[in-house]
């Protein structure tokens, strides 16, 4: 580390005076201190000489001696005050920039430490501090106020108590930058636009920022719109607007409207389309089939896009049957507003009944007129069978009557044995009815098939059983010829709350 | 909801001294200035000091300087004002006020205690 | 220390009709854009509310017919429509520098 003589931290001398500073070091040797005149350098090898021989008060500040070789970087420094009676101060710089929330020194060095006691800083024109100004005092320094804000960006001065009077420094002006974290923040509204030609509209494009230094500008299809601009300061944020107004609207109005706005930190920007159409319109739409089959007891949502401009003024979900006048409670539809001009409508229909298959009709209204989308609902139900035995054309016949949606497929079985079902390794054969006869088919209802099964003699110890199944489940019947009536064994189970 | 709440109403012989407190709940305590206020029905609201919560750091009205001594306690949220050798003319209304510690510069007092009456009678 | 000068003194206003009420300061209250006034209510036997904040801000909760303007030395409070509620006294107070001031106050009173 290299050494100051004299070996003092402070040396207090008055104007005129003349000053050596002699550092040593094991290597050559530099030294740093305040920009000021008559001071003359002299080297040699592995010291240095710093001397004056007429002392001022801008001689005042500290010198440090530094060896450049040195890795560890080691310095020493010596604080001079050349006290001036008429001169206190010694103002190093005359502006001082930081960022906010920084702490920004005020470099005015005391030139006599005796008058630190009665020392303070005020903004000029003898204006008090600002409130909570933060700020502290060292002699060898100057002011430092803590955490600097934008608005003490100020004009400010240094005082010292000398002889019971106050004497200031020059000026030295603060400025305090805010911290920009990034482009200007952007809103365009509306985010979408649709006129009738002839209408009026307006788009809105504006950006905000903690300091006033940006620009924006409104562009339509990439050509920039001349729009006078208003300016705010608000909450803390400067913000300007651009209000493009359109008394009638026609269709050279209508593309793509940039919002843009740009400041040091770089670029945003915000876009929106604004259309122009002939006349109202209204368009319903579904990302569902509008044909849906649901299982008895399940639920179902009816979904419904709607594009329509103007707004609509009214809308409905109606049930057209074929089971009952029975219409949708109110509390099962919702809407929802996906923008402006785009709405969803959902009827909620949970755990269905039989008597609520049928057509369900959206039906929406506009000043462009009424429209309509209409879901068809079937309900998918799991096959109940029924076998009788009967003579056709004076043979025996066993007769299977299957109702179900979507149509049951039958198949025949006879096993040994009397048994509620034929398990496989009972079976003594198997039929399959391909084209079982339809009986009934009507929309929305189930679909009834028969099956015959001529059989020459019943077996007596043998059972005969009736299958049926389609896409929900599967159902059968069992007839025992011995007794005194066949033996059902119902549908699969199946349950559902009414 | 933000409360401050103030001690209740003081009768005080002249040259007495009277402490009154101010308990804040539902805020940060730290993160705003306490601020005192004087209303007398003839000289309107007068701003007596401040004290930061964090570091007990004080500013005083040069009026109030020797009258009035501000204090915190951070562990019970509440600060209080001393105020001294008493006089018909403090006979007043005292309110706490909070003062937001912020990037904002404003310093507006957001929120006041209820007030605490002060008498000063022989 | 800055003075702050309210008038009217008092005032009355008719039920739904603006009144205004002015402040100004001995000293500018304004630094880069930023105007260090605000607007307190006080009804009696209640404590001050802040209503305005920053001369033209609206504090949280406080209904839009109230608002505020100006800058440097001179400033004002709108209230319109006025409401039956609105009977209170209406102070300003500085906060640029110590200490914070307040104006003597006006007492506003609904016809």
């Known amino acids: 580390i290299p050494v100051i003589e004299p070996s003092v931290p402070e040396l207090v001398v008055k104007p005129g005076a003349t000053v050596t500073l002699r550092c040593v070091g094991n290597g050559s040797v530099e030294w740093d201190g305040p920009p000021s005149p008559h001071w003359t350098l002299y080297s040699d090898g592995s010291s240095s000489i710093l001397s004056t021989n007429n002392a001022t008060f801008q001689n005042t500040g500290t010198y440090r001696c530094t060896e450049p070789g040195d890795p560890l970087g080691g310095s020493a420094a010596i604080h001079l005050y050349v006290k001036d009676p008429a001169r206190p101060w010694n103002v190093l710089a005359q502006e001082v920039v930081v960022f906010e929330d920084q702490d920004a020194l005020l470099p005015c060095l005391l030139t006599d430490p005796v008058l630190e006691a009665g020392v303070s800083l005020v903004r000029v024109r003898g204006r008090p501090l600002m409130r909570h100004t933060n700020y502290s005092f060292s002699p060898w320094h100057g002011f430092t106020i803590h955490r600097a804000k934008f608005i003490q960006s100020q004009d400010y001065q240094c005082s010292a108590l000398m002889g019971g009077r106050k004497v200031m420094s020059i000026s030295i002006r603060l400025k305090v930058q805010k911290v920009i974290p990034g482009p200007p923040a952007l809103t365009l509204v509306p985010a979408e636009l649709v006129r009738i030609r002839g209408e009026a509209a307006q788009i809105v494009c504006s950006a905000s920022s903690v300091d006033v230094n940006f620009d924006v500008f409104l562009q339509h299809n990439n050509t920039k719109l001349a729009i006078p601009q208003q300016s705010d300061f608000h909450n803390n944020r400067y913000q300007k607007v651009l209000t493009l107004n359109l008394d009638q609207v026609d269709f050279q109005h209508a593309g793509n409207y940039s919002c843009v706005a740009s400041n040091v930190q770089g670029k945003h920007s915000t876009s929106m389309f604004f259309r122009v159409v002939e006349s109202a319109y209204l368009n319903l739409s579904s990302e569902q089939n509008l044909i849906q089959e649901v299982t008895v007891g399940e639920g179902l949502n009816l979904k419904v896009m709607v594009e329509a401009y103007p707004g609509l003024q009214g809308f409905n979900w109606t049930y057209l049957g074929p089971f009952s006048d029975h219409q949708p409670e109110p509390k099962l539809a919702n809407a929802t507003t996906k923008d402006t001009y785009r709405h969803t409508f959902t009827l909620s229909l949970p755990r269905l009944k039989p008597s609520e298959a049928g057509r369900y009709s959206f039906l929406a209204r506009n000043p462009g007129g009424w429209r309509a989308l209409t879901f068809e609902l079937t309900l998918r139900y799991p096959p109940e069978v029924s076998v009788i035995w009967t003579f056709i054309n004076g043979s025996g016949t066993l007769l299977c009557a299957a109702s179900g949606y979507p149509q049951p497929n039958v198949t025949w079985l006879q096993c040994s044995g009397h048994t509620d079902r034929c398990d496989e390794a009972q079976v003594l054969q198997v039929w399959d009815d391909p084209y079982p006869e339809v009986l009934s088919q009507e929309p929305f209802h189930k679909v009834t098939v028969q099956s015959l099964l001529t059989v020459e003699t019943l077996e007596h110890n043998q059972t005969y059983e009736c299958r049926a199944h389609n896409s929900v489940g599967s159902g059968s019947w069992a007839f025992i010829p011995i007794s005194a009536g066949a033996h059902t064994h119902p549908p699969d189970e199946f349950l559902f709350t009414p | 909801e933000v409360q401050l709440q103030q001690s209740g109403p003081e009768l005080v012989k002249p040259g007495a001294s009277v402490k009154i407190s101010c308990k804040a709940s539902?805020?940060?305590?730290?993160?705003?200035?306490m601020n005192w206020v004087k209303q007398s029905p003839g000289k309107g609201l007068e701003w007596i000091g401040d004290?930061?919560?964090?570091?007990?750091?004080?500013t005083y009205n040069q009026k109030f300087k020797g009258k009035a001594t501000l204090t915190v306690d951070k562990s019970s949220t509440t600060a209080y004002m001393e105020l001294r050798s008493l006089t018909s003319e403090d006979s007043a209304v005292y309110y706490c006020a909070r003062e937001k510690i912020s990037m904002e510069y404003y310093y507006a007092m957001d929120y006041w205690g209820q007030g605490t009456s002060v008498t000063v009678s022989s | 220390d800055i003075v702050l000068t309210q008038s009217p003194a008092s005032l009355a206003v008719s039920l739904g009709q603006r009144a205004t009420i002015s402040c100004r300061a001995s000293e500018s209250v304004s630094s880069h854009d930023i105007h260090l006034m605000h607007w307190y209510q006080q009804k009696p036997g209640q404590s001050p509310k802040l209503l305005i904040y920053a001369a033209s801000n609206l504090e949280s909760g406080v209904p839009a017919r109230f608002s505020g303007s100006g800058s440097a030395t001179d400033f004002t409070l709108n209230i319109h429509p006025v409401e039956e509620e609105d009977a209170a006294t209406y102070f300003c107070?500085?906060?640029?520098?110590?200490?914070?001031?307040f104006g003597g106050g006006t007492k506003l009173e609904i016809k």
């Open positions: 004290i930061n919560p964090n570091n007990g750091g004080t």
């Open positions: 539902a805020i940060t305590f730290t993160d705003y200035y």
């Open positions: 107070q500085q906060s640029i520098e110590d200490p914070p001031t």
